[in-house]
Interface confidence: low
C-alpha cells in the first residue's frame, strides 16, 4: 500500500519544485475528522515532529483499545482494534541541517484503526 | 494526517537524492496483509499506475461495504464502513515526460477501512 | 503480452488432494488479483478464490474449508490447492489475473487474463 | 452469494442479428458487473467490465447497459466469430459469482 514500488527507471538525483499542487481540490478536510472518535476502534492522534524532515509535522494514530467498542458501548475484548498502516514517502535534509540537499525516505505511519476478528489458533 | 503541513522554512527548489532510505527495517511488510479482509470494514486494494508521478504505482482502498460485518458474519447497515483517507506526497514530472525535474504534490489516498456509528438526524 | 501458464494433476481419486500451479510470463505479478475459477464439464463458471498483491485471500464460502491459495512472488507463481476431493470436483481448472480498472472516481474489476485450463479427473 | 441469472440459456441467431442477453442479479450490485465470451474448448474471453465499458480491442458491436439488478449484453450485427457462450460476472462483492451462461447458436 502507498508507495511501495521501487521505480527503476529513475534517475538518482533530481530538481524538485517544493512548491506544492494540491490535487486534492474536491475534498472537505473536515469530513472524516471525527471518524477517530466514532470509529468501533477509535484511534488517538499524535504529532511527530522532525525538523530535519519534510514535511516536518506527520500525525500518527494510536488505538485506544485493544478490543472493539460494541454497540453497548463497551469495548468487547473478543474483537481486536489494529492500526492501518501505510508507507509514505518523505524527504530527509542530506546531509543534516542542509538547506536544499534532500534524500528520499520511506517510512511506515499508522493512519487509524479498523476492528477486526482475532486469528484463533485451533489446539487438536 | 500525513503530511499536512507546509514548511514554509523551506526554499523553492531542491536537488533531491531518489536512492530510498527505507527506516521500516523492522516491519513485516506482510503483517497486516489480511486486514482488508478480516476488518467488520473489509475493503478491496485497487492499483492507481502513474508513470508520470513518483511513485508511480499507489495502492487506493474501496470499501466493499456501505454497512459493517456483525458477529453472525452479515452486513449491518446501521453502521457504516467508511475510508480512513492521508494526504501523502508524490514527485510529478514538470514538465510532462520530464526525466529529472519534479514537482511536489499532494494526493488523498484511501489507505483502509473503519466501522464507524452513522450520523443520525433527529426529525423533531 | 502477459501470459498465464497452469500445470498439475490430471487424475486423482476421491479424497486426495487437488494441486495447481499458474506462473505469470510477460507481466508483473505485483499488484493484481491472482483468481481460480473452475468450470464442470458442459456447466458454467465457479469462482474459487483470489489471492490478492499483498498475500491476502478471499474464497467461495462453498470450498473455504478445503481451499487454499498460495502465492511464491519470487517465481511469478500462484498456487491452489484444494483437499478431499470427490467427483464432483471434476472441472477443466483456469487461472486468471483481476484486474482494476477506474472510470471517473470508481473502479471496475475484470479477469483480463486466463491460463489455459486443466482439465482435473476425480475417479477411482 | 449474490445469484446472477441469465436469459435465455441458449437462442438461436443468424449472421447480422441483433442479440440481446440479459443477466438479473439477486440484490443491486450497482454497475459492477462485467460480460465474457467463450467459444467450445476455448478460454473465456474479457469483453466488457463496469457494465458498458468495453475492453481493449473487443469491437464496437459489443455493447452493454444496465444498472442496479437487470443488465444486458448485446450484439448489433451478430458476425461468425461471435457464435459462443456469454457469462456475466458481478465483482460487487464477494464470492464472485457468474450467470449460468447464455449460447448463442445458428439458427
Known amino acids: 500500500m502507498g508507495p511501495n514500488s521501487e521505480d527503476k527507471n529513475f534517475p538518482r538525483t533530481v530538481m524538485v519544485n517544493l512548491n506544492i499542487h494540491n490535487r486534492n481540490t474536491n475534498t472537505n478536510p473536515k469530513r472524516s475528522s471525527d471518524y477517530y472518535d466514532r470509529s468501533t476502534s477509535p484511534w488517538n492522534l499524535h504529532r511527530n515532529e522532525d525538523p530535519e524532515r519534510y514535511p516536518s509535522v506527520i500525525w500518527e494514530a494510536k488505538c485506544r483499545h485493544l478490543g472493539c467498542i460494541n454497540a453497548d458501548g463497551n469495548v468487547d475484548y473478543h474483537m481486536n482494534s489494529v492500526p492501518i498502516q501505510q508507507e509514505i514517502l518523505v524527504l530527509r535534509r542530506e546531509p543534516p541541517h542542509s538547506p536544499n540537499s534532500f534524500r528520499l525516505e520511506k517510512i511506515l505511519v499508522s493512519v487509524g484503526c479498523t476492528c477486526v476478528t482475532p486469528i484463533v489458533h485451533h489446539v487438536a | 494526517m500525513g503530511p499536512n503541513s507546509e514548511d514554509k522554512n523551506f526554499p523553492r527548489t531542491v536537488m533531491v537524492n531518489l536512492n530510498i532510505h527505507n527506516r521500516n527495517t523492522n516491519t513485516n511488510p506482510k503483517r497486516s496483509s489480511d486486514y482488508y479482509d478480516r476488518s467488520t470494514s473489509p475493503w478491496n486494494l485497487h492499483r492507481n499506475e502513474d508513470p508520470e508521478r513518483y511513485p508511480s504505482v499507489i495502492w487506493e482502498a474501496k470499501c466493499r461495504h456501505l454497512g459493517c460485518i456483525n458477529a453472525d458474519g452479515n452486513v449491518d447497515y446501521h453502521m457504516n464502513s467508511v475510508p480512513i483517507q492521508q494526504e501523502i506526497l508524490v514527485l510529478r514530472r514538470e514538465p510532462p515526460h520530464s526525466p529529472n525535474s519534479f514537482r511536489l504534490e499532494k494526493i488523498l489516498v484511501s489507505v483502509g477501512c473503519t466501522c464507524v456509528t452513522p450520523i443520525v438526524h433527529h426529525v423533531a | 503480452q502477459v501470459q498465464l501458464q497452469q500445470w498439475g494433476a490430471g487424475l486423482l481419486k476421491p479424497s486426495e488432494t487437488l494441486s495447481l500451479t499458474c506462473a505469470v510470463f510477460g507481466g508483473s505479478f505485483d499488484g493484481y488479483y491472482w483468481n481460480w475459477i473452475r468450470q464442470p464439464p458442459g456447466k458454467g463458471l465457479e469462482w474459487i478464490g483470489e489471492?490478492?498483491?499483498?498475500?491476502?485471500?478471499i474464497y467461495n464460502p462453498s470450498l473455504k474449508s478445503r481451499v487454499t491459495i498460495s502465492e511464491d512472488t519470487s517465481k511469478n507463481q500462484f498456487s491452489l490447492r484444494l483437499n478431499s476431493v470427490t467427483a464432483a470436483d471434476t472441472a477443466t481448472y483456469y487461472c486468471?489475473?483481476?484486474?482494476?480498472?477506474?472510470?471517473?472516481?470508481?473502479?471496475?474489476?475484470?479477469?483480463?487474463?486466463w491460463g489455459q485450463g486443466t482439465p482435473v479427473t476425480v475417479s477411482s | 452469494d449474490i445469484l446472477m441469472t441469465q436469459s435465455p440459456s441458449s437462442l438461436s441467431a443468424s449472421v447480422g442479428d441483433r442479440v440481446t442477453i440479459t443477466c438479473r442479479a439477486s440484490q443491486d450490485i450497482k454497475n459492477d458487473l462485467g460480460w465474457y465470451q467463450q467459444k467450445p474448448g476455448k478460454v473465456p474471453k474479457f469483453l466488457i467490465f463496469?457494465?458498458?465499458s468495453l475492453q481493449s480491442g473487443v469491437p464496437s458491436r459489443f455493447s452493454g447497459s444496465g444498472s442496479g439488478t437487470d443488465f444486458t449484453l448485446t450484439i448489433n450485427s451478430l458476425q461468425p466469430e461471435d457464435f459462443a457462450t456469454y457469462y456475466c460476472l458481478q465483482d460487487n462483492n464477494y464470492p464472485r459469482t457468474f450467470g449460468q451462461g447464455t449460447k448463442v447458436g445458428f439458427k
Open positions: 463496469g457494465t458498458y
Open positions: 489471492i490478492n498483491h499483498i498475500g491476502g485471500t
Open positions: 486468471a489475473r483481476g484486474i482494476t480498472m477506474g472510470r471517473g472516481n470508481y473502479y471496475y474489476y475484470g479477469l483480463d487474463v
